[in-house]
Interface confidence: medium
């Protein structure tokens, strides 16, 4: 469910939401670290209804969600840093 994506050349998310996305509707989470042309962490959620949502990486509920996902798939999940990039 949680994967890392390292090859973006620019930011994918033009805007983010902070409202909770239920675990039951999540198909996949992608955490992209800063760099490779995008200066900020991006968190993209694919829902089971094939909808793509950009989520605020600072949202507290997302941190809880990542903890939950991590505890379920500790050894098999690629990890990417959830971190902002400083302003140039």
């Amino acid at each position: 469910i949680l994967e890392a994506h390292y090859t973006n050349l620019k930011c994918r998310c033009s805007g983010v939401i902070s409202t909770v996305v239920g675990l039951n509707i999540i198909d996949r989470i992608q955490v992209t670290p800063p760099g490779n042309g995008c200066p900020k962490t991006e968190v993209v959620i694919w829902t089971k209804m094939k909808k793509v949502i950009c989520v605020n990486p600072r949202a507290k509920w997302l941190q809880r969600l990542l903890r939950h996902v991590q505890s379920k798939s500790l050894s098999s999940t690629p990890q990417a840093p959830v971190s902002k990039r400083r302003a140039a």
Partner: antibody, heavy 120, light 107 residues
Framework: EVQVQQSGAELVRPGSSVKMSCKTS????????IIWVKQRPGQGLEWIGY????????EYNEKFKGKATLTSDTSSSTVYMQLSSLTSEDSAIYFC?????????????WDQGTSVTVSS | DIQMTQTTSSLSASLGDRVTISCRSS??????LNWYQQRPDGTVKLLIY???RLHSGVPSRFSGSGSGTDYSLTISNLEQEDIATYFC?????????FGGGTKLEIK
């Protein structure tokens, strides 16, 4: 058991380069990153950069761009750091650590470090 | 860069004491704060990540708390093996930065 094991101490000449290694075991190598940290004698810790193995993605502290180069070899689950144009300021202990990036951006397993002494 | 400040560079305490080490960041780091122990032999270990979560294998006498820009590490019942230097580190914004360290000694 997760382990990271670094190469031995280096004594090098000013102006030269050095390449040190960080061999990992006990987890899926391509699923995590390796972080490098510098510690000068009697001083604090300084983040150099990280490498994400799956795609060879790297990120550097601006201060170490052009100084440090991070690479990896998936066949041996090893990460390398090369330091170039060495000066006395580069004399330090260099640590590698596994990146625990699911939250907090912590460094969860460290080795004892590689000591680099730059001297003529 | 975010500056991490550990105002107390050294601290003396007695075995069995409750010890608190503080760390302040120059801006809000959203709880992305980790604590490390460096023993006299140079060995570094992660103790606490994401402000308050205990890393596996770390004794429960260690705890962390804080929010915003102010964070602390508490050792509830100081033992001989806890004699070390403690560093905080922020993982909120690149470049990740460390505090200067607090050296804990026995009275």
């Amino acid at each position: 058991e997760v382990q990271v094991q670094q190469s031995g101490a280096e004594l090098v000449r000013p102006g030269s380069s050095v390449k040190m290694s960080c061999k990992t075991s006990g987890y899926t190598f391509t699923n995590y990153g390796i972080i490098w940290v510098k510690q000068r004698p009697g001083q604090g810790l300084e983040w150099i950069g990280y490498i994400y193995i799956g795609k060879g993605y790297t990120e550097y502290n601006e201060k170490f761009k052009g100084k440090a180069t991070l690479t990896s070899d998936t066949s041996s689950s090893t990460v390398y750091m090369q330091l170039s144009s060495l000066t006395s300021e580069d004399s330090a202990i260099y640590f590698c650590a596994r990146g625990a990036h699911y939250y907090g951006n912590a460094m969860d397993y460290w080795d004892q470090g590689t000591s680099v002494t730059v001297s003529s | 860069d975010i500056q991490m400040t550990q105002t107390t560079s050294s601290l003396s305490a007695s075995l069995g004491d409750r010890v608190t080490i503080s760390c302040r960041s120059s801006q809000d780091i959203s709880n992305f704060l980790n604590w490390y122990q460096q023993r006299p032999d140079g060995t570094v270990k992660l103790l606490i990540y994401y402000t308050s979560r205990l890393h596996s294998g770390v004794p429960s006498r260690f705890s962390g708390s804080g929010s915003g820009t102010d964070y602390s590490l508490t050792i509830s019942n100081l033992e001989q093996e806890d004699i070390a230097t403690y560093f905080c580190q922020q993982g909120d914004t690149l470049p990740w930065t460390f505090g200067g360290g607090t050296k804990l000694e026995i009275k």
